[in-house]
Amino acid sequence: KAMHVAQPAVVLANSRGTASFVCEYASPGKATEVRVTVLRQADSQVTEVCAATYMMGNELTFLDDSICTGTSSGNQVNLTIQGLRAMDTGLYICKVELMYPPPYYMGIGNGTQIYVIDPEPCPDSD
């Protein structure tokens, strides 16, 4: 079943290559187990950036080597992606799945265009 997911249209990464955005979903029921996946669409390909499954009221747990961190509050997920470089500029899509209890729901946001600008190297000082 389909579910509405909202996310900002554009986000600019900071000078350290970190970008944050909120992914909000309209839960049709009382889900206890939620899976959040961040996808990147660029060059006619969609790749998975990171994913986490969490129990409502608990923290999101990404894999140790993930570039993503996040927190949840109700039907909102605050996502942070780190270590971004200019080449990582692209459309980042939030996918939310209500895993338990049934019925299964899935929603996909319209994507957040994340712009990453590599910082200029500091000039050598004499």
Epitope: Q41, I108, N110, G111
Partner: nanobody, 126 residues
Framework: EVQLVESGGGLVQPGGSLRLSCAAS????????IGWFRQAPGKEREEVSC????????NYADSVKGRFTISRDNSKNTVILQMNSLRAEDTAVYYC???????????????????WGQGTQVTVSS
Amino acid sequence: EVQLVESGGGLVQPGGSLRLSCAASGGTLDYWSIGWFRQAPGKEREEVSCISGTGLRTNYADSVKGRFTISRDNSKNTVILQMNSLRAEDTAVYYCTGKLLHPSLWSACANEYDLWGQGTQVTVSS
């Protein structure tokens, strides 16, 4: 760059079945809208079936409803067209087509397609 490759065509008797496969080389079909078209000698190309990027929506031409089934096998990076109860009028070259839409349209079939395979011949004859 992604290329589409069809397989599974051949000669089959009326009432028989064939399973056409559309695979991607040089990339994945994840979240792509995929369509199957066919063209019989002396006839216009017609869309037979399509499946949305999420796989939640499928469409069929009236002439194949109830006989053909389209599905995604993301683990094998393929889209399958299962053709049952084949008739002589199903004889044609079958083409796989694909397009990666904006995420807001992942639940829909594409209106037009960017990518076309080379086609596979299906002949239904006794």
